[in-house]
């Protein structure tokens, strides 16, 4: 029979580190990790990490017993967390019978939006204490709510990940610039942000119908020449406060008719929570 | 049954390269480490490295590193060694092998004489 | 890179003695050891792999022990067709090395 992994949490260290081994196994070959999606009862969906890595092809694979896999995550809080992965058969040969390296996976390390994550991989037995053993290590960063992915998880979308608020901005003239957007029920106040390299005029919306969505619009003055000029609009969320996902737009003259003219709408970008 | 079967003997000038084929039948051409051993008139025997046709890994003696490559072809189940810069100490009965479950070397090539002289 | 000491380099022995070669690794190899023959003009031919297990078609006469450094190529009684050169050849990652061989010539 093949070896397979049966892979179980193992926080302290293993068992085999307080043991002298004359000869150990050799290091990994590969260790990659993507996530991968998964449904939630809640309707929701939860990210992991697929992590998979290849044994090297040599005979020291013979006193391979496991893998050991931990992970270290850096955001606001750092997380660390260990799985042991046990192999259930003794390795008869170096390759596997079809061809090609033993290569395993492991799916269940959760992850969180925009986080660094560090994952070491060695196997075990491992070095004696005081010994530097083979291992290997990858870092892997969580993409935020404007990934494509990501951005349908319902924290996502409470902090606007879905909000396009469309907006168009021109220049009425050489102090003013009008700024229209639509709304999103999930909040009732917004900035809107005058920029050309300098800020050349802000004004605070707040909109009392939340419950709908409306075409919102502002008259806001500004301090400088603003065609061309970026807007910026920052939501304030429940979820999110003060770092909710931006969006940008660009301030073109406005036509004859006094009618805001639309351009980039779709340009958004992420505060510095990016959930 | 398995089978290896090499290309013919080769008088090279030193300097030159010679490149050396092993054709593998009778067995999964790449559910196996493909090896190269070569032995000097009258002498033991010398790993040269290896080759997993399944997707090209080599690994080779330190020794060599520098001047030999390691290919196959896999659409017909054959490996290939290539040795550059050849010297008069190269010549040498070349063999490929195939490892085994492990690498003991089960099945061997009838070997080619290469013959490096000026 | 593990060497490989092969003893004795070559030995006279008649048809019907038990002959031993030892073969000795420069660190523990953990029994990843294989046996060749050699005759004259020809490929080695694999005899025993993982110190004791006899490769298809070869003789129960041949044996093999040893574990650790220190592994020994026994064959109870020889025959005719046994006089060659015999090689070892540790695969305990690479590079493998093999001993510097033991031929075996008639008495």
């Known amino acids: 029979r093949e070896p397979t992994v049966q892979c179980g949490s193992e926080t302290g260290p293993s068992p085999e580190w307080m043991l002298q081994h004359d000869l150990i196994p050799g290091d990994l070959r590969d260790l990659r990790v993507e996530p991968v999606t998964t449904s939630v009862a809640t309707g929701d969906y939860s990210i992991l990490m697929n992590v998979s890595w290849v044994l090297r092809a040599d005979a020291s694979i013979r006193l391979l017993k496991a893998t050991k896999i931990c992970v270290t995550g850096k955001s606001n809080f750092q997380s660390y967390s260990c799985v042991r992965c046990n192999y259930t058969e003794a390795f008869q040969t170096q390759t596997r019978p079809s061809g090609g390296k033993w290569t395993f996976s492991y799916i269940g390390f959760p992850v969180e939006l925009n986080t660094v994550y560090f994952i070491g991989a060695h196997n075990i037995p491992n070095a004696n204490m005081n010994e530097d053993g083979p291992s290997m290590s990858v870092n892997f960063t969580s993409p935020g709510c404007l990934d494509h992915i990501m951005k349908y998880k319902k924290k996502c979308v409470k902090a606007g990940s879905l909000w396009d608020p469309n907006i168009t901005a021109c220049k009425k003239n050489e102090e003013t610039v009008e700024v229209n957007f639509t709304t999103t029920p999930l909040g009732n106040r917004y900035m809107a942000l005058i920029q050309h390299s300098t800020i050349i005029g802000f004004s605070q919306v707040f909109e009392p119908h939340q419950k709908k969505q409306t075409r919102a619009s502002v008259v806001i003055p500004v301090t400088g020449d603003s065609e061309g000029a970026t807007v910026q609009l920052t939501p304030y969320f429940p979820t999110c406060g003060s770092d909710c996902i931006r969006h940008k737009g660009t301030v073109v003259l406005c036509p004859q008719t006094g009618v805001p003219f639309p351009l980039d709408n779709n340009k958004s970008k992420p505060g510095g929570w990016l959930p | 049954q398995v089978q290896l079967v090499q290309s013919g003997a080769e008088v090279k000038k030193p300097g030159a390269s010679v490149k050396v084929s092993c054709k593998a039948s009778g067995y999964t051409f790449i559910s196996y480490w493909m090896n190269w051993v070569r032995q000097a008139p009258g002498q033991g025997l010398e790993w040269m490295g290896r080759i997993d046709p399944y997707d090209s890994e080599i690994q080779y003696n330190q020794k060599f590193k520098d001047r030999v490559t390691m290919t196959r072809d896999t659409s017909i189940s054959t490996a290939y060694m290539e040795l550059s810069r050849l010297r008069s100490d190269d010549t040498a009965v070349y063999y490929c092998?195939?490892?085994?479950?492990?690498?003991?070397?089960?099945?061997w090539g009838q070997g080619t004489l290469v013959t490096v002289s000026s | 890179d593990i060497q490989m000491t092969q003893s004795p380099s070559s030995l006279s022995a008649s048809v019907g003695d038990r002959v031993t070669i030892t073969c000795r690794a420069s660190?523990?190899?953990?029994?990843?050891l294989a046996w060749y023959q050699q005759k004259p003009g020809k490929a080695p031919k694999l005899l025993l792999y993982d110190v004791t297990n006899l490769a298809d078609g070869v003789p129960s006469r041949f044996s093999g022990s040893g574990s650790g450094t220190d592994y020994t190529l026994t064959i109870s009684s020889l025959q005719p067709e046994d006089f060659a050169t015999y090689y070892c050849?540790?695969?305990?990652?690479?590079?493998?090395?093999f001993g510097g061989g033991t031929k075996v010539e008639i008495k």
């Open positions: 092998a195939r490892s085994g479950g492990f690498d003991w070397f089960a099945y």
């Open positions: 660190e523990n190899i953990n029994s990843n």
């Open positions: 050849q540790h695969f305990w990652g690479p590079p493998y090395t």
